[in-house]
């Protein structure tokens, strides 16, 4: 017996094609059929329009073996055309056909939306033989239906290479609205309009949308899904969600936070990684980006010196990596360094300033008045010079480097000598006779080697020549001196 099966008059079909009948139930029961004792019957919907002429595929059998009479066309009996039920309910439906006993090996298959249902489906086929015909009932059950079970189900049967197809049974699983598009978190410019989108579907339709901003409803009346909310602008962070309503109830979307873009927070933890005489390598930890990506950063450098004019050097750099080598600095100087970064909204405040120092540099000037001559023994070259006037930043003089190059008959050899800072003269052994010796001297500090003096050349004659005349650093603009002995 039918426990609760109510036919629903639909104002329009939810599915294409003719609907032979429609049944809405949340306790889907089926009609009892005559059955043999001991068999628990499959239940079946009674045909909603039993007198309707069949329009589907039929198999027209050939003449019987006696040749005396034609059998009627084979066709599935009409059954319910449309079942409407709620999500998570159980449903069972069937199709039935009476097949003359002359046919053997009849099998029925179930198809959904044009695809055969194979494997783990609850399909049962029962046979009820009689004298002339066998009633076949194929039932299909789904436990705890889901939206994915929505669709058009049909039975197919093959006889004599002919295919008989049942009318479709449309299963419509109804439930709470299901979101196909939910609002997304965004970072927006203050007081600038932006859009949020919300879309939900049934069945049942229609689905209506309410927007909620910071727990207050934006629209007093429902709006049809999909709905686009134009937010006219925000001055502070807000949380948005949308409610989707249909006849089954309400589903609420995830709440999304809309942040207001702001200037970044200042960088923190500015630290010194390496100092040289003229450069400092720094790194920093970026501050909060203000909900807008960093574009670039600015390194600000002030010389800490009572005598300096307090001007600030600004070096622009990319925001990543969070590291910068500050160049063009003075040696042995103290600097105050700060970092600021910017996004599309503007510049952050400057980080806390840190102190950093450059190391002592190499001398910037060469020794003066370099003089070169042969001594009496003729085995040594005497070199004399004056200490250069070095700046404080060059640091403390630690000595001198002497370069002497010997050239003779296409052969050239350079030798280097180091002497202490207290010296202003040096002697070097004659390396080659009948050759030119070119001498240059550079001052040395902990910061490095300064520039070499202009070259001074002296000719070293073959044995037997005697000469005491010196060669010296030229006055500016003069050609390199060469003493010819």
């Amino acid at each position: 017996a039918i426990t609760e099966a109510r036919e629903e008059a639909k104002p329009y079909p939810l599915f294409p094609g003719p609907l032979p009948g429609s049944l809405q139930t949340d306790h889907t029961s089926l009609l009892s059929l005559p059955h043999t004792s001991g068999y628990q019957p499959a239940l079946m919907f009674s045909p909603t329009q039993p007198g309707r002429p069949y329009t589907g595929n039929v198999a027209i059998p050939r003449v019987t073996s006696a040749g005396s009479k034609l059998l009627p066309p084979l066709a599935f009996k009409h059954t319910v055309g449309h079942i409407i039920l709620s999500e998570h309910k159980d449903v069972k439906f069937n199709c039935s056909i009476s097949v003359p006993n002359i046919y053997q090996d009849t099998t029925i298959s179930w198809w959904k939306d044009g695809k055969e249902l194979l494997g783990a489906h609850h399909a049962i086929t029962q046979f009820y033989p009689d004298d002339e015909v066998t009633a076949i009932i194929a039932s299909f059950s789904i436990t705890s239906v889901q939206r994915s079970d929505n669709g058009s189900y049909i039975c197919k049967m093959k006889i004599n290479n002919e295919e008989i197809v049942s009318d479709p049974i449309y299963i419509e699983v109804q439930g709470l609205p299901h979101f196909t598009k939910q609002p997304e978190s965004m970072n927006v410019t203050r007081n600038t309009a932006f859009n949020l989108t919300c879309q939900a579907v049934g069945p049942p339709e229609p689905v209506n949308i309410f927007w909620v901003q910071n727990s207050s409803r934006v629209n007093e009346q429902p709006e049809k899904s999909p709905s686009v909310l134009t937010v006219p602008g925000l001055t502070e962070m807000a949380v948005f969600s949308c409610e989707a309503h249909n006849d089954k109830g309400l589903t609420v979307s995830k709440g999304v936070q809309i942040n207001i873009k702001a200037i970044p927070s200042p960088p923190t933890e500015v630290s010194i990684h390496n100092s040289t005489a003229h450069s400092i390598l720094i790194s920093w930890v970026p501050g909060f980006d203000g909900y807008s990506p960093f574009r670039n950063c600015s390194v600000q450098v002030k010389e800490v010196d009572p005598l300096s004019n307090g001007s600030v050097m600004i070096f622009n750099t990319s925001a990543s990596p969070h590291m910068y080598q500050i160049k063009q600095l003075q040696a042995l100087a103290n600097y105050s360094i700060g970092v600021s970064c910017m996004n599309e909204i503007g510049w952050s405040a400057v980080s806390p300033w840190i102190l950093a120092s450059t190391t002592e540099g190499a001398p910037s000037v060469a020794p003066l008045n370099v003089t070169v001559f042969l001594n009496e023994s003729r085995d040594n070259v005497d070199i004399r010079w004056m200490k250069p006037l070095t700046k404080r930043q060059a640091g403390e003089l630690v000595g001198y480097r002497i370069s002497h190059v010997w050239q003779s008959a296409g052969i050239s050899k350079e030798l280097l000598e180091e002497v202490g800072q207290n010296n202003s003269r040096a002697q070097i052994s004659v390396q080659v006779h009948n050759a030119t010796c070119t001498v240059r001297i550079a001052a040395v500090t902990k910061g490095g080697v300064g520039p070499f003096s202009d070259p001074v050349k002296i000719f070293i004659p073959a044995h037997g020549w005697v000469d005491h005349a010196p060669s010296s650093t030229p006055a500016p603009g003069n050609a390199d001196p060469v003493l010819i002995i």
């Epitope: 007081n191 927007w211 901003q213 910071n214 207050s216 934006v218 629209n219 007093e220 009346q221 429902p222 709006e223 909310l229 006219p232 602008g233 001055t235 807000a238």
Partner: antibody
Framework: QVQLVQSGSELKKPGASVKVSCKAS????????VHWVRQAPGQGLEWMGW????????TYAQGFTGRFVFSLDTSVSTAYLQISSLKAEDTAVYYC???????????WGQGTLVTVSS | EIVLTQSPATLSLSPGERATLSCRAS?????MHWYQQKPGQAPRPLIY???NLASGIPARFSGSGSGTSYTLTISSLEPEDFAVYYC?????????FGGGTKVEIK
């Protein structure tokens, strides 16, 4: 264009009833609520409540329950305000407005003056 | 309910002057709308959602604010701007209006 046209002025005796109409045109009536606003002579604006034109459900502000009834005839896109048991203090101009998102009253009727006097 | 307090109650100014009208809410609101009303006329929408001009409203009108403090500014008063101005909040029911600020010719 969007228009809200209200019925004409009414002179009523205390204890009587009055029904003010507000006919909407130029938009889909069921998409926007209709709000009612009262303005007593020389006074400011006072929100009385609104009616949901989609479901027909009225919402009344405090002080406007009981004698005040909002109703609809969606077939003619018209909202109504009925006041029963009129008192002298009900003398005011009554405005209907269209309620947009964020409770913004974007279109107003021209107002209906209801005078209650014996 | 949220109470809106408008100040000053009356503002006496000359054409060409700048008018600054204040609307304070008893608790934080999401947006403030502003309406203009002239004698014998229905209110007219002026500013939507704190800072957006209603259609047909000249650019000399502007709105700002957040939380509990909102402002309507008329940069340079024209003769037709002398009227009563009302604020109205969106956040919670009931929808409430401020008491109004009358801008009159000095």
């Amino acid at each position: 264009q969007v228009q809200l046209v209200q019925s004409g002025s009414e002179l009523k005796k205390p204890g009587a009833s009055v029904k003010v109409s507000c006919k909407a045109s130029g938009y889909t009536f069921a998409n926007y609520g209709v709000h009612w606003v009262r303005q007593a002579p020389g006074q400011g604006l006072e929100w009385m409540g609104w009616i949901n034109t989609y479901q027909g459900e009225p919402t009344y502000a405090q002080g406007f329950t009981g004698r005040f009834v909002f109703s609809l005839d969606t077939s003619v896109s018209t909202a109504y305000l009925q006041i029963s048991s009129l008192k002298a203090e009900d003398t005011a101009v009554y405005y209907c407005t269209r309620g947009a998102r964020y409770a913004y009253m974007d279109y107003w009727g021209q107002g209906t003056l209801v005078t209650v006097s014996s | 309910e949220i109470v809106l307090t408008q100040s000053p109650a009356t503002l006496s100014l000359s054409p060409g002057e700048r008018a600054t009208l204040s609307c304070r809410a008893s608790s934080s609101v999401g947006y403030m709308h502003w309406y203009q009303q002239k004698p014998g006329q229905a209110p007219r929408p002026l500013i939507y959602a704190t800072s957006n001009l209603a259609s047909g409203i000249p650019a000399r009108f502007s709105g700002s604010g957040s939380g509990t403090s909102y402002t309507l500014t008329i940069s340079s008063l024209e003769p037709e701007d002398f009227a009563v101005y009302y604020c109205q909040q969106w956040s919670s029911n009931p929808r409430t209006f401020g008491g109004g600020t009358k801008v009159e010719i000095k």
